[in-house]
């Protein structure tokens, strides 16, 4: 059928609660595209009827709620004018027993979100709630070891739990609970979070490593399209910004009018000890003015540049 297959990471989910997955694969989905969801290579698309327990909501697939039998591989097909991509998402559903005392309290949360608080600092945890606009998310409550969190040091603000003056006792098993309302029906979302404490300086305290580029020049023909990746490794809990700049200005701002040179959407791959981030710069058409100019990739306090160069003339052609 001419569709390019893309395989996404597995998602491990809790049964009996809502779940949603957004079919986005930048830059494919940034233009005029149609998105259709399927289950297990079925030819019949997932329903778009909002009363259906499983249905497509714009680019999202929405489970209200997720059930035991919903495990499987789901495909979303992104069709553009001249392209077709099929993204495969493997969803695994399992039972969660949060604070059922007969099962012995919270389960092993190794599969759930892991978050870090920085000792002695003011820091925060996030309740990750990814749902389409049709879902209204209600008040969020936070629990530690199954008890609702209260006290001067804790403040629930939007999707975050602000923790002031983090102490070693703040490590442990947390859960955030939100009420989700969709088409007049209410559902409970409960996310488990394993919290560890680190003494290492947070909020950009780490120094990211730019793997590529390496302060070098690239030979490129005038008028061609060029895409250059900036690859960065950084700690999992970093807050460093990664971006491309020219003349000390974000490329998207510098080329705001022409949009000839743009920064891509950042992606990352998670490893055990670190994340590998990729953010590209796209030259839709290389012009004379681009040559000799350092295009800088910034990652926190680290920088690296590329300089475009005209290829040396090939005298063999004469």
């Amino acid at each position: 059928d001419g569709c390019k297959d893309i395989f996404m990471k597995n998602e491990i989910l809790s049964a009996s609660q809502p779940f949603a997955f957004n079919c986005t694969f930048p830059p494919i989905t940034s233009g005029e595209v149609s998105v259709t969801w399927y289950k297990n290579s079925s030819k019949i698309p997932v329903s778009k009827i909002i009363q259906s327990r499983i249905h497509q909501d714009e680019t999202w697939i929405l489970f209200l709620p997720m059930e035991w039998g919903d495990s499987g591989v789901y495909q979303c097909v992104i069709k553009g004018r001249d392209s077709c991509h099929r993204i495969h998402v493997n969803l695994t559903v399992f039972e969660k027993h949060w604070c059922d005392t007969s099962i012995g309290g919270l389960p092993n949360l190794s599969d759930e979100y892991k978050q870090i608080l920085h000792l002695g600092k003011d820091d925060s945890l996030t309740c990750h709630l990814h749902f389409p606009k049709s879902c209204v998310l209600g008040p969020i409550k936070w629990y530690k070891d199954c008890n609702e969190i209260k006290g001067e040091r804790f403040t629930v603000l939007e999707t975050r739990l602000l923790v002031s003056n983090v102490s070693a006792e703040d490590r442990g098993n947390y859960a955030c609970q939100a009420i989700l309302t969709h088409s007049g029906k209410q559902y409970e979302v409960l996310n488990g979070i394993t919290v560890s404490i680190t003494e290492r300086a947070g909020y950009g305290g780490s120094v990211p490593k730019i793997i590529y580029p390496k302060n070098h020049s690239i030979e490129v023909q005038l008028g061609t399209t060029l895409i250059v990746d900036c690859n960065v490794t950084d700690t999992k809990d970093n807050t460093n910004l990664r971006c491309w700049r020219v003349n000390n200005t974000l490329v998207d701002d510098y080329y705001d009018e022409s949009k000839r040179i743009r920064e891509g959407v950042e992606t990352h791959v998670s490893f055990r000890e670190h994340n590998l981030y990729t953010v590209n710069i796209t030259f839709l058409e290389v012009k004379m003015e681009d040559y000799g100019l350092p295009f800088m990739c910034h990652a926190g306090v680290s920088t690296a540049y590329i300089i475009l160069q005209l290829p040396a003339p090939d005298f063999r052609a004469y």
Partner: antibody, heavy 120, light 112 residues
């Protein structure tokens, strides 16, 4: 629709206290923080603190911690902000404000403002 | 406390022309969760402030699309593509990454 209606203007003497009310309607009162922001003449906006009717939780800007008390009356969905030991520099318009939603910040809803004048 | 610094202090713009306001925070407002806790408000005379942009680049409900927000973790820009007479007032940037919530000093925009 969400509405925040504040009490009327007040004139107070230095050293006195003022209690400004903010009556909320159009949403579940106990689900949201109520924030208080003030603007003194020719000055910018200043966040004073916030109050959560669920559990009577107050979070104050340290600048006001000894002088501000926030309370509520759930039966009328009203939050009160009391500022004590008034001085001339407390002359300002006081606003109550609510966030956009429970998960998105930014003050999308504001009271009309209450002018408090402190003068001897 | 996080300090928000706005430039310029005032701006005089011809109707139909673009305008740009900058704001810098003393600490990165980009959280580990990839949300930037940064906001723009417009305070018109005799009215309460109005939310324009939330989380750095999202247009608040009912705000015309001639307004746009962009930036990095510490440097932010509010752009008005074509200024209209109704856009006059004082523009404030704000953060809610952490308590206390803080505002910038304001930028007064007037029409030439």
């Amino acid at each position: 629709q969400v509405q925040l209606v504040q009490s009327g203007a007040e004139v107070k003497k230095p050293g006195a206290s003022v209690k400004v009310s903010c009556k909320a309607s159009g949403y579940t009162f106990t689900n949201y923080w109520m924030n208080w922001v003030r603007q003194a003449p020719r000055q910018g906006l200043e966040w004073m603190g916030m109050f959560h009717p669920y559990g009577d939780v107050t979070r104050l800007n340290q600048k006001f911690k000894d002088r501000v008390t926030m309370t509520r009356d759930t039966s009328t969905s009203t939050v009160y902000m009391e500022l004590s030991s008034l001085r001339s520099e407390d002359t300002a318009v006081y606003y109550c404000a609510r966030t956009t939603s429970m998960i998105i910040g930014g003050f999308a809803y504001w009271g009309q403002g209450t002018l408090v004048t402190v003068s001897s | 406390d996080i300090v928000m610094t706005q430039t310029p202090l005032s701006l005089s713009v011809t109707p139909g022309q673009p305008a740009s306001i900058s704001c810098r925070s003393s600490k990165s407002l980009l959280h580990r969760n990839a949300i930037t806790y940064f906001y723009w408000y417009l305070h018109k005379p005799g009215q309460p402030p109005q939310l324009l942009i939330y989380q750095m680049s999202n247009l608040a409900s009912g705000v015309p699309d001639r307004f746009s927000g962009s930036g990095s973790g510490t440097d932010f820009t509010l752009k008005i593509s074509r200024v209209e007479a109704e856009d006059v007032g004082v523009y404030y940037c704000a953060q809610n990454l952490e308590l206390p919530l803080t505002f910038g000093g304001g930028t007064k925009v007037e029409i030439k």
